[in-house]
């Protein structure tokens, strides 16, 4: 029987910069029941606080609700693991909420085949940013990525759309049914999950284009 091993806070995520959650990995348990507590202070403070919510994020997590979340101040936190034989502490972790945002997937993905008379046909898609993300403030830039594939294909074809919320793809296989998805990330944050797949049937008379794709 031994004191617990050193835990590690390995992940922090915020869906919208208004709340966030951090998760830790326990070290070895030393063969005894182990209690974990997360303590933190914000930059400019010396007063230590205990995690406000150990439940919402699931096991080995700490959730900071709206009243505990500030974008303006860096959080300094550590986890203490304690059993009957002693304690161990994680390394200190510094968290700036700006840099841990993982948004929800983009919304309202619509996909259409466009067949202008004077030009080659193309696949046109558009989407909306996730509702929880406030883009009006200006500091929050979302980047988008699209992936698509024929229904029975194994490999996805991926396109980076930058900050655009619409996109054209010119090179597709006629007669195929395609799955299309989009995801987003803030410049210094994390990719969202992929949006639900949207299906589109490419007409058999769709003319393959020499050029691959381009931004709208």
């Amino acid at each position: 029987q031994l004191p617990p091993g050193k835990p590690e806070i390995f992940k922090c995520r915020s869906p919208n910069k208004e709340t966030f959650t951090c998760w830790w990995r326990p070290g070895t348990d030393g063969g005894l029941p182990t209690n974990y507590s997360l303590t933190y202070h914000r930059e400019g403070e010396t007063l230590m606080h205990e995690c406000p919510d150990y439940i919402t994020g699931g096991p080995n997590s700490c959730h900071f609700g709206k009243q505990y979340t500030s974008m303006w101040r860096t959080y300094v936190m550590m986890v203490n693991a304690t059993n009957q034989m002693g304690s161990s502490f994680s390394d200190e972790l510094y968290v700036d909420v700006t840099y841990i945002v993982q948004p929800d997937p983009p919304l309202e993905l619509t996909v259409e085949v466009k067949q202008p008379e004077d030009r080659k046909p193309y696949l046109w898609m558009k989407w909306s940013p996730p509702t929880l993300i406030d883009l009006k403030t200006g500091w929050f830039t979302l980047l988008y990525e699209i992936r698509l594939k024929p229904e029975k294909a194994a490999e996805w074809e991926t396109h980076f759309a930058g900050q655009q919320t619409e996109f054209k793809i010119l090179s597709l296989h006629p007669g195929q049914k395609y799955l299309v998805q989009v995801r987003c990330k803030p410049d210094h944050g994390y990719w969202s999950a992929w949006s639900p797949a949207t299906f589109i049937q490419i007409p058999s008379d769709f003319i393959m284009n020499d050029h691959h794709h381009h931004h709208h």
């Epitope: 974008m71 303006w72 390394d91 972790l93 968290v95 500091w139």
Partner: antibody, heavy 118, light 112 residues
Framework: EVQLVQSGAEVKKPGSSVKVSCKAS????????IHWVRQAPGQGLEWIGE????????NYNQKFKGRATLTVDKSSSTAYMELSSLRSEDTAVYYC???????????WGQGTLVTVSS | DIVMTQTPLSLSVTPGQPASISCRSS???????????LHWYLQKPGQSPQLLIY???NRFSGVPDRFSGSGSGTDFTLKISRVEAEDVGVYYC?????????FGGGTKVEIK
């Protein structure tokens, strides 16, 4: 203990490429961005770019875009910085550095001296 | 790119005396999220840089309280209240508000 251990010194010819490695230990490699900074002899510090090891997303200093390539190997917890079309002005110590969930550099590698000489 | 200008270029200080380093940026370092990402690093002779102060005025873990940072907008200062022999090296200010991140030219601190 967090450690960033870099590869050894290199001497390269002008026009060639160099690939510097940075092996991370003591933490979950995919959690934090890795940055690359260089320091020419007797000079200040210059930021080359950054990479998120979780998905290999990169941001580069425009000055190095097209010449510097940042990559990671998650299986060995190693980050790489490759610089191509080397010239004498690229002679410098190259550092990798790690952030937290922040945008400043909390841990630094020991540095790798790259000398470009004909 | 944001230009960071440090003064003085070098500083020779008697142990126990204060020292002050100034850093000026060519544009405001207030991020659109409201934070000011101005940091100070020390590079001791023969070593890699080490973080002293983050976000203008916050001492990093293990940094002695004789180091303090202040300033706002474009003008920032690092103060050492009582210089010790172990404080010798080159001090750099750095901004990470705007990409590319940039550093000042450095201030060399020596002991008299």
């Amino acid at each position: 203990e967090v450690q960033l251990v870099q590869s050894g010194a290199e001497v390269k010819k002008p026009g060639s490429s160099v690939k510097v490695s940075c092996k991370a230990s003591g933490y979950t490699f995919t959690s934090y961005w890795i940055h690359w900074v260089r320091q020419a002899p007797g000079q200040g510090l210059e930021w080359i770019g950054e990479i998120d090891p979780s998905d290999s997303y990169t941001n580069y200093n425009q000055k190095f875009k097209g010449r510097a390539t940042l990559t990671v190997d998650k299986s060995s917890s190693t980050a790489y910085m490759e610089l191509s079309s080397l010239r004498s002005e690229d002679t410098a110590v190259y550092y990798c550095a790690r952030s937290f969930f922040t945008n400043w550099f909390a841990y630094w590698g020991q540095g790798t001296l790259v000398t470009v000489s004909s | 790119d944001i230009v960071m200008t440090q003064t003085p270029l070098s500083l020779s200080v008697t142990p126990g005396q204060p020292a002050s380093i100034s850093c000026r940026s060519s544009q405001s370092l207030v991020h659109s999220n409201g934070n000011t990402y101005l940091h100070w690093y020390l590079q001791k002779p023969g070593q890699s840089p080490q973080l002293l102060i983050y976000k203008v005025s916050n001492r990093f873990s293990g940094v002695p309280d004789r180091f303090s940072g202040s300033g706002s907008g474009t003008d920032f200062t690092l103060k050492i209240s009582r210089v010790e022999a172990e404080d010798v090296g080159v001090y750099y200010c750095s901004q990470s508000t705007h990409v590319p991140f940039t550093f000042g030219g450095g201030t060399k601190v020596e002991i008299k």
